[in-house]
Amino acid sequence: LPAQVAFTPYAPEPGGTCRLREYYDQTAQMCCSKCPPGQHAKVFCTKTSDTVCDSCEDSTYTQLWNWVPECLSCGSRCSSDQVETQACTREQNRICTCRPGWYCALSKQEGCRLCAQLRKCRPGFGVARPGTETSDVVCKPCAPGTFSNTTSSTDICRPHQICHVVAIPGNASMDAVCTSTSPTRSMAPGAVHLPQPVSTRSQHTQPTPAPSTAPGTSFLLPVGPSPPAEGSTGD
């Protein structure tokens, strides 16, 4: 004879566990159904009645199978230094990431809590390490034979032009000025051409942290024998 399929709620075997998308209710002492993403528990199970689920209200969500009595609040709208890369739905939180020219100075579980402008290297300095989504630009002084005459978060030190006759010698912040009509470019030491940053970013001044108005809806990860599962066990 095939094993009988148990319908929720049911008492688990001694030492046994509940099935996928079920949880052990410590009050009812039964295996009960979880609610799907986008829903929450409206009525907890009893020994004879299963969990009753209901849809999350506007601006709230649940991302996992769960038995939380209330959906989580979506984070507030993205701030002016951010772009919304994922909208708030019943099944997912809003995600805010930094707009071009900015990087994430303080991340959260998903997206960014605080964006800051990418550092600009002033004349005489070039980009040693380009900015990424999560790290600032690193500047370095231009080595002898190279220069940068811009204030930029992307420009590297470039080699001085080599003149047949030098009118004005180059320095770290200025190219050489030639009297001859056909200057050539040297590959001076330290004039390695760096790749562009990961994302195209506009040029800005020294880092000024801009506070984000989107505090993260932090998942409270319960510890203990039977967590409410939103933010803990998945499918």
Partner: antibody, heavy 119, light 106 residues
Framework: QVTLKESGPTLVKPTQTLTLTCTFS??????????VGWIRQPPGKALEWLAH???????YYNPALKSRLTITKDTSKNQVVLTMTNMDPVDTATYYC???????????WGQGTTVTVSS | DIQMTQSPSSLSASVGDRVTITCKAS??????IAWYQHKPGKVPKLLIH???TLQPGVPSRFSGSGSGSDYTLTISSLQPEDVATYYC????????FGGGTKVEIK
């Protein structure tokens, strides 16, 4: 408007059985997720949960008092009855009934009834 | 059974003071905690459920926080009408009340 009211004897002799009735209005115990529980408070002491019954007749009792308690409901009369056997002077308390939500907390309470156990 | 240890058992504070009451559960209760205000001769009144959800009509000076086994009720600015005994209730596994905190005005 949700209201609950407790009724029963004010004086009980030791070893006797106490029977308390909670009569409620503004909700029905046939409605999914509804429940009614009993809580007591001895003079100068903390609140203590006693028993609870759900819309589907599922019942829960305080493990320390389980052998002495019985909770029943009469849905048509909007009543829940608690009986407590073998009363003792330490059971002297104000007894409250309260509505319970589907997510298991008491949201509306009755005014309470004082029961004294004395010979 | 889950035990709820509530502290302090009593406190006296001035009007406008910030008041904090704590409840510690003997095990994780997964945020299933409610707070009640009980005034002498009155019915216990639900203030907060599921750790931090304020009941409609309850003043915003009341707030709740916590997770795991440690929970807090805060009155941000104590008012004369807040004189009462406050109880926590865990409803993660059956139901257990804390011992109560009597709040008085100095």
């Amino acid at each position: 408007q949700v209201t609950l009211k407790e009724s029963g004897p004010t004086l009980v002799k030791p070893t006797q059985t106490l029977t308390l009735t909670c009569t409620f209005s503004g909700f029905s115990l046939s409605t999914l997720g509804m429940g009614v529980g009993w809580i007591r408070q001895p003079p100068g002491k903390a609140l203590e949960w006693l028993a609870h019954i759900w819309w589907d007749a599922d019942k829960y009792y305080n493990p320390a008092l389980k052998s002495r308690l019985t909770i029943t409901k009469d849905t048509s009369k909007n009543q829940v009855v608690l009986t407590m056997t073998n009363m003792d002077p330490v059971d002297t308390a104000t007894y409250y009934c309260a509505r319970m939500t589907g997510t298991r907390y008491f949201d509306v309470w009755g005014q309470g009834t004082t029961v004294t156990v004395s010979s | 059974d889950i035990q709820m240890t509530q502290s302090p058992s009593s406190l006296s504070a001035s009007v406008g003071d910030r008041v904090t009451i704590t409840c510690k559960a003997s095990q994780n209760i997964n945020k299933f905690i409610a707070w009640y205000q009980h005034k002498p001769g009155k019915v216990p009144k639900l203030l907060i459920h599921y750790t931090s959800t304020l009941q409609p009509g309850v003043p915003s000076r009341f707030s709740g926080s916590g997770s795991g086994s440690d929970y807090t009720l805060t009155i941000s600015s104590l008012q004369p009408e807040d004189v009462a005994t406050y109880y926590c209730l865990q409803y993660g596994v059956l139901w257990t009340f804390g011992g109560g905190t009597k709040v008085e005005i100095k």
